[in-house]
C-alpha cells in the first residue's frame, strides 16, 4: 500500500493576513486566524512529518481584500509561489479582472500547474494562452505519479469577466476524456481538483469513471467528523464518501474557505491505484499554530503600499451620501441606492441577446449600511471611507429566488418597522410599495420588479412562481437580519465580490456620483 | 533583459505641462512599481511617486501631489509622468525606475531609464 | 516623512583606501527583520544604479568592495579598497513607510 497526504485550501480569498474568527480584519493577533504565515508553518510540519505529501488549492484565490485591489494577483502568485503549492484549479474569481488580470499576474508568474479541463480558449486567445493553463497534470509523488484534473464552475460567466473567448463546458463531459488519457498513460491515481461547488464534486465522484478522490471549492463547504473545533457547522463528514456509478467508494473533500483551515487528507492506494482508506479532517489554523517569521516579515513589507491606499481618492460624490441608520432603517436612503447600483453594475454581463442582463435585481439590509459620507470633505471618496460604510468585510452574491420568497423578504423588511431594526431592505431593480395600517406579514401591497429578457427594462409585477435572480450581500444569503426564508428557500447561491471593492469600482468608473432619492420604495397614503 | 526607455528632452514654459513617458520591456511590466524621480542640476534625488500597473494604483510625494499624475498603459506596458503649472525650479532630470519590491529587493529601484531632461 | 542625513556631504580619497559613509534616518526603518535602507551609485551624467539593498544585500553584478550594514536608524556604507572607477556620488533610500525619501548625497573624489 502507498499512502498519499493532501492538503488543500479553497475560496481564500485575499485573505492573505490572518484574520478574526469571521474571517474579517484581524484585530485582537492573539484570537486570530489563518494567513499564509500560519498556514506556511502548518505545511512545513506536515511536510516534515510525512513521505507523500501534496499542497492543493481548488480556486478563488483572487477577490476579497484590498491585497486583491492593489496588487490585482501578483500576491497571490508570490505567496503561493512561497508556499510551493503543488496544484491549482481556476475558480470563477480567477477571471474578475477578465483573462489578462488572469494571465498576466497569475497564469506566467506562477510556478506550479493552474488546471482546469472544462475551459477551452477559441480565436485569438487560445494561442495566447496556451500551455498557461492545463486539463491535468502528473505530479511526481515520491517513487508515483499522481494525475491531477481540473475543472471550474460553468457558471463562471454569469459569475465574473471571463470573455468571449473561453467556453466553459459542462464539467462530466470534459472530465472523462481527460481522465481517460491520464489511465491511458498508466497514471493510476487520480484526484479532480475543481471550483463548482460541493453538489458537482458529489456528481464528479459518481459520474466520473477513473477519478479516486475530488477536492473541491465554490460552495465553502465545511466537513468534518466528530467535534468541530470553531463556528462553522458540518454539511458532513470528512472525507464525505460517494459510492460510484462503478461501485468504488470516493472521498469527497473540500475546507470552507478563507484560509481558515487547511484541509488535511490521508489517503491509501493499494498497487493498483485503488482507494483502500480514506481519513482526515480540516486543521483549524488558530494562534496555537505560529505564523512562519520569514513568510510573515513577506507580507508586512507588502503591506508597506497598502497603507496608503485607503486614503487615496476613488472619485467624488456631489451629494450627501445618507448612510444614516434613522434614513436607511426606515425609508429609502441614497446611499442604498448607490450600493445597490454598484452591485448591479458589477454584475453586467451580456450573455445572451435576449437578456439585456442576466440580473436586474438588487436587496440589501438597511442595517448594514454604516455611515454617511459627508460631500462637504471636498466631495472626496477614499477607500477609508467606505471602509466606515461597509465594515464587516462581506461579499455581494448572486441568489436564485423564487418569487414567493422575495414576497416573503419584503414582508419580513416592514414586520416590526419603526423600531430601527437593520432589517428593512434597500433596493436597486425593484419598486416596492408598504402599508403599515396592515398587519405585519401582509404589509407589501404592490411589488414590480424590472425585467431582464427585455431590449427596453420596465417595472412589471412580481410574479410568485418565476424564478429571479438577485443579488444581495453575503449576510442575507446566510439568513442575517432574520432573512431565514432566504437561506431555507434559495434555489442557488454563489459567492461575488468584496462589498467595498464593488462599490469602490464603481465610484472609480463613474468618476462623480449624485444618488437620489428617487421613488424605490414607498408607503401608501395614510400610514407613513 | 529589464529595459527602461524614456522619452526625449523637454523645454516648456512656465505655466505649461510637461508629460515624460518610460517603456518597460523584460519582465512582467504589471507586476512591479514603477517609481518617478528627479534631479535638479547639482543637486540630489528626490522621489515624486510611482505607480503599480497592474492596478493603476498610485503614491505621490506631498510636494508635488497637486501638481503630478503618474499613469500606465498595460497594453504598451509604458508609464507616464505629467506635471503641470511648471516653474523654473521645476528644471531637473527625470527618472523613472523599476522598484523590485515584491521578491527580495524590497522597493528599491533596481532597474533605471536613462532620464528626461526638462526645462522650464 | 522620513528625512535621511548623509555624511561626510564629500570625501576625498585614495586608490585603495577604506571609505566610510553614514547615513541616519529620522525613524527607525527596521521592522520584522528587514532594514529597509538601500544604497545607489551615481556617476556624472548617468542614471543611478543599485548597489545594496534591504542595508546588506548586495545586488547582482556588484563588486563585492562595496558593502552596508545598521538596522534601526544607523546604516554604514563600505568600500574596502577604493578604486578610481568608484569616483561618484552615494546615496541611501529608505523604503519603510511612503514618501520614500533619499538622502542628499555623498560625493568621493580619488585624490
Known amino acids: 500500500a502507498w499512502e498519499l497526504t493532501i492538503l488543500h485550501t479553497n475560496d481564500v480569498h485575499s485573505r492573505l493576513e490572518q484574520t478574526s474568527e469571521d474571517s474579517s480584519k484581524c484585530v485582537n493577533a492573539s484570537r486570530c486566524m489563518g494567513g499564509v504565515a500560519r498556514l506556511f508553518t502548518k505545511v512545513q510540519q506536515i511536510r516534515r512529518a510525512e513521505p507523500n505529501v501534496l499542497l492543493l488549492d481548488a480556486g478563488d484565490q483572487y477577490q476579497g481584500t484590498i491585497w486583491f485591489t492593489v496588487y490585482k494577483g501578483a500576491e497571490v502568485a508570490h505567496f503561493m509561489n512561497a508556499l510551493r503549492y503543488d496544484a491549482m484549479a481556476l475558480g470563477n474569481h480567477e477571471f474578475d479582472n477578465g483573462v489578462e488580470g488572469l494571465i498576466e499576474p497569475l497564469l506566467k508568474e506562477a510556478k506550479f500547474p493552474i488546471l482546469s479541463a472544462n475551459i477551452k480558449a477559441k480565436g485569438p486567445l487560445a494561442s495566447q494562452i496556451s500551455g498557461l493553463y492545463l486539463p491535468y497534470k502528473v505530479l511526481p509523488v515520491g517513487d508515483e505519479v499522481v494525475g491531477i484534473v481540473g475543472y471550474t464552475s460553468k457558471e463562471t460567466p454569469f459569475l465574473s469577466n471571463p470573455g468571449t473567448n473561453l467556453v466553459f463546458e459542462d464539467e462530466i463531459t470534459a472530465l472523462q476524456p481527460e481522465v481517460d488519457k491520464l489511465k491511458t498513460l498508466n497514471v493510476n491515481k487520480i484526484i479532480a481538483l475543481g471550483h463548482s461547488g460541493f453538489e458537482m464534486d458529489k456528481l464528479i465522484a459518481q459520474k466520473v469513471r477513473g477519478v479516486d478522490v475530488v477536492v473541491g471549492g465554490h460552495s465553502n463547504t465545511f466537513l468534518y467528523t466528530g467535534n468541530p473545533p470553531s463556528k462553522e457547522v458540518p454539511a458532513g463528514k470528512y472525507p464525505f464518501i460517494v459510492t460510484s456509478d462503478d461501485g468504488r467508494k470516493v472521498p469527497v473533500v473540500q475546507a470552507y474557505a478563507f484560509g481558515k483551515y487547511l484541509g488535511y487528507l490521508k489517503i491509501e492506494f493499494d498497487e493498483r491505484g485503488n482507494v483502500i482508506s480514506s481519513h482526515g479532517n480540516p486543521i483549524l489554523l488558530n494562534s496555537s499554530i505560529p505564523e512562519d517569521p520569514s513568510i510573515k516579515a513577506d507580507i508586512n513589507k507588502w503591506r508597506i503600499k497598502l497603507d496608503n491606499y485607503s486614503t487615496q481618492e476613488l472619485g467624488k460624490t456631489i451629494v450627501y451620501l445618507d448612510g444614516s441608520s434613522q434614513s436607511c432603517r426606515f425609508r429609502e436612503c441614497n446611499m442604498g441606492n448607490l450600493i445597490c447600483d454598484a452591485m448591479i453594475n458589477n454584475n453586467l454581463r451580456h450573455t445572451d441577446e435576449m437578456f439585456w442582463n442576466h440580473v436586474s435585481m438588487c436587496i440589501l439590509n438597511g442595517g448594514g449600511i454604516r455611515s454617511p459620507i459627508d460631500e462637504r470633505n471636498n466631495g472626496t471618496i477614499t477607500w477609508e471611507n467606505l471602509a466606515a460604510v461597509l465594515p464587516f468585510g462581506g461579499t455581494f452574491d448572486l441568489v436564485q429566488l423564487k418569487g414567493s420568497t422575495l414576497k416573503k423578504a419584503f414582508e419580513h423588511s416592514v414586520h416590526r418597522y419603526g423600531q430601527s431594526t437593520g432589517e428593512f431592505l434597500q433596493v436597486g431593480g425593484i419598486h416596492v410599495v408598504y402599508d403599515l395600517s396592515r398587519k405585519p406579514g401582509d404589509r407589501v401591497v404592490k411589488l414590480d420588479v424590472l425585467c431582464t429578457k427585455c431590449r427596453v427594462p420596465s417595472y412589471d409585477p412580481l410574479k410568485m412562481d418565476e424564478v429571479y435572480k438577485v443579488i444581495l450581500p453575503n449576510f442575507l444569503a446566510n439568513g442575517g437580519d432574520g432573512f431565514q426564508m432566504i437561506k431555507d428557500e434559495l434555489l442557488r447561491h454563489d459567492s461575488g465580490d468584496q462589498d467595498i471593492n464593488v462599490v469602490s469600482t464603481y465610484i472609480s468608473k463613474m468618476k462623480v456620483i449624485y444618488p437620489a432619492v428617487e421613488g424605490r420604495i414607498k408607503f401608501s397614503t395614510g400610514s407613513h | 533583459q529589464v529595459q527602461l526607455v524614456q522619452s526625449g528632452a523637454e523645454v516648456e514654459k512656465p505655466g505649461a505641462s510637461v508629460k515624460v513617458s518610460c517603456k518597460a520591456s523584460?519582465?512582467?511590466?504589471?507586476?512591479?512599481?514603477i517609481t518617478w524621480v528627479r534631479q535638479a542640476p547639482g543637486q540630489g534625488l528626490e522621489w515624486m511617486g510611482d505607480?503599480?500597473?497592474?492596478?493603476?494604483?498610485?503614491n505621490y510625494n506631498e510636494k508635488f501631489k497637486t501638481r503630478v499624475t503618474i499613469t500606465a498603459d498595460k497594453s504598451t506596458s509604458t508609464a507616464y509622468m505629467e506635471l503641470s503649472s511648471l516653474r523654473s525650479e521645476d528644471t531637473a532630470v527625470y527618472y523613472c525606475?523599476?522598484?523590485?519590491?515584491?521578491?527580495?529587493?524590497?522597493?528599491?529601484?533596481?532597474?533605471w531609464g536613462q532620464g528626461t531632461l526638462v526645462t522650464v | 516623512a522620513i528625512q535621511l542625513t548623509q555624511s561626510p556631504s564629500s570625501l576625498s580619497a585614495s586608490v585603495g583606501d577604506r571609505v566610510t559613509i553614514t547615513c541616519r534616518a529620522s525613524?527607525?526603518?527596521?521592522?520584522?527583520?528587514?532594514?529597509?535602507m538601500h544604497w545607489y551609485q551615481q556617476k556624472p551624467g548617468q542614471a543611478p544604479r543599485l548597489l545594496i539593498y534591504?542595508?546588506?544585500n548586495l545586488e547582482s553584478g556588484v563588486p563585492s568592495r562595496f558593502s552596508g550594514s545598521g538596522s534601526g536608524t544607523d546604516f554604514t556604507f563600505t568600500i574596502s579598497s577604493l578604486e578610481a572607477e568608484d569616483a561618484a556620488t552615494y546615496y541611501c533610500?529608505?523604503?519603510?513607510?511612503?514618501?520614500?525619501?533619499f538622502g542628499q548625497g555623498t560625493k568621493v573624489e580619488i585624490k
Open positions: 525606475a523599476k522598484e523590485g519590491g515584491l521578491t527580495t529587493e524590497d522597493y528599491a529601484l533596481d532597474y
Open positions: 525613524k527607525n526603518v527596521s521592522t520584522s527583520g528587514y532594514s529597509y
Open positions: 523584460g519582465y512582467t511590466f504589471t507586476s512591479y512599481w
Open positions: 505607480i503599480y500597473p497592474g492596478s493603476g494604483n498610485t
Open positions: 533610500q529608505h523604503s519603510r513607510e511612503l514618501p520614500f525619501t
Open positions: 534591504l542595508a546588506s
